[in-house]
Amino acid sequence: MMTGTIETTGNISAKKGGSVILQCHLSSTMAQVTQVNWEQHDHSLLAIRNAELGWHIYPAFKDRVAPGPGLGLTLQSLTMNDTGEYFCTYHTYPDGTYRGRIFLEVLESSVAEHSARFQIP
């Protein structure tokens, strides 16, 4: 029934104080996306993008999280505490729920490599 696949930016690294784009993409399904949830490693919700209501950024992250591009999320003013797992959850009809995982490593180094390849988790 669930024919789709989630592609994500996979394992990425970014510099402390910088910004990073978290991106997921759902493909290979006819299902309609009604909502996308973005969660942090401790399962706290960062943001929700509802098809009808648009974006809602949770208050604790309002200053450092920007919606987009697309259904993705931009994290700004990165700190070392931002290191960890991030999850995108796609709620779709009639397939159900698809979930993607991204691991972000925030580096002290001024020469942090920022890799953003797409991969299937």
Epitope: M30, T34, Q35, N50, A51, E52, Y93, P94, G96
Partner: antibody, heavy 122, light 106 residues
């Protein structure tokens, strides 16, 4: 007010075609999937299929392929059901129904059209 | 396809009665179940979704329970306007409806 308003009753001869419309108002049409449900006289509800209102991709349920076509005109927030080569057994009330809920367990058909009676008789 | 079997098909009851309708799924559907009420000549109306969540505006005498393969719709105290046909629907995969339960006045 959120509502779905369907076109009026139709009387058709066998072999003819019919196109039923379902006009949405009070919400963003492209944000919610649309379903079609058939109810033959004195019978229960049968899910016919659905259309992705964002992409226009239709999906037909088993038993409703070939002669049954779902389409959209997003500019007027309207979904359509076209049935070709009508048969007497197509006589039924046809409903459009929106999928409400953000996702997960919350999905359900929260808004229904009033129904369109299609009678096929020679 | 997932089949839903409703029981009973017909139910006679009186105003004030407590009634229970059962819906059994041919395989586990977690809580992906909704209940609808339909009156003659009218479109179905959503009563309950997610097996037990009451739709906005629906009286609290209606309640739903269950998970997996067995679900129930309960009306705690029947009112005259409750005499109608009730359908369960699964949304775990492509939707299907139960055969319906016609609730009649005794």
């Amino acid at each position: 007010e959120i509502q779905l308003v369907q076109s009026g009753s139709e009387l058709k001869k066998p072999g003819a075609s019919v196109k039923v419309s379902c006009k949405a108002s009070g919400y963003t049409f492209t944000s919610y999937p649309m379903n079609w449900v058939r109810q033959a006289p004195g019978q229960g509800l049968e899910w016919m299929g659905w259309i992705n209102t964002n992409t226009g991709n239709p999906t037909n349920a088993q038993g409703f392929t070939g002669r049954f076509v779902f389409s959209l005109d997003t500019s007027v927030s309207t979904a359509y059901l076209q049935i070709s080569s009508l048969k007497a057994e197509d006589t039924a009330v046809y409903y459009c129904a929106r999928v409400g809920g953000y996702g997960g367990y919350d999905y359900a058909f929260d808004i229904w059209g009033q129904g369109t009676m299609v009678t096929v008789s020679s | 396809d997932i089949q839903l079997t409703q029981s009973p098909s017909f139910l006679s009851a009186s105003v004030g009665d407590r009634v229970t309708i059962t819906c059994r799924a041919s395989q586990g559907i977690s809580s992906y179940l909704a209940w609808y009420q339909q009156k003659p000549g009218k479109a179905p109306k959503l009563l309950i979704y997610a097996a037990s969540t009451l739709q906005s505006g629906v009286p609290s005498r209606f309640s739903g329970s269950g998970s997996g393969t067995e679900f129930t719709l309960t009306i705690s105290s029947l009112q005259p306007e409750d005499f109608a046909t009730y359908y369960c629907q699964q949304l775990n995969s492509y939707p299907t409806f139960g055969g319906g339960t016609k609730l009649e006045i005794k």
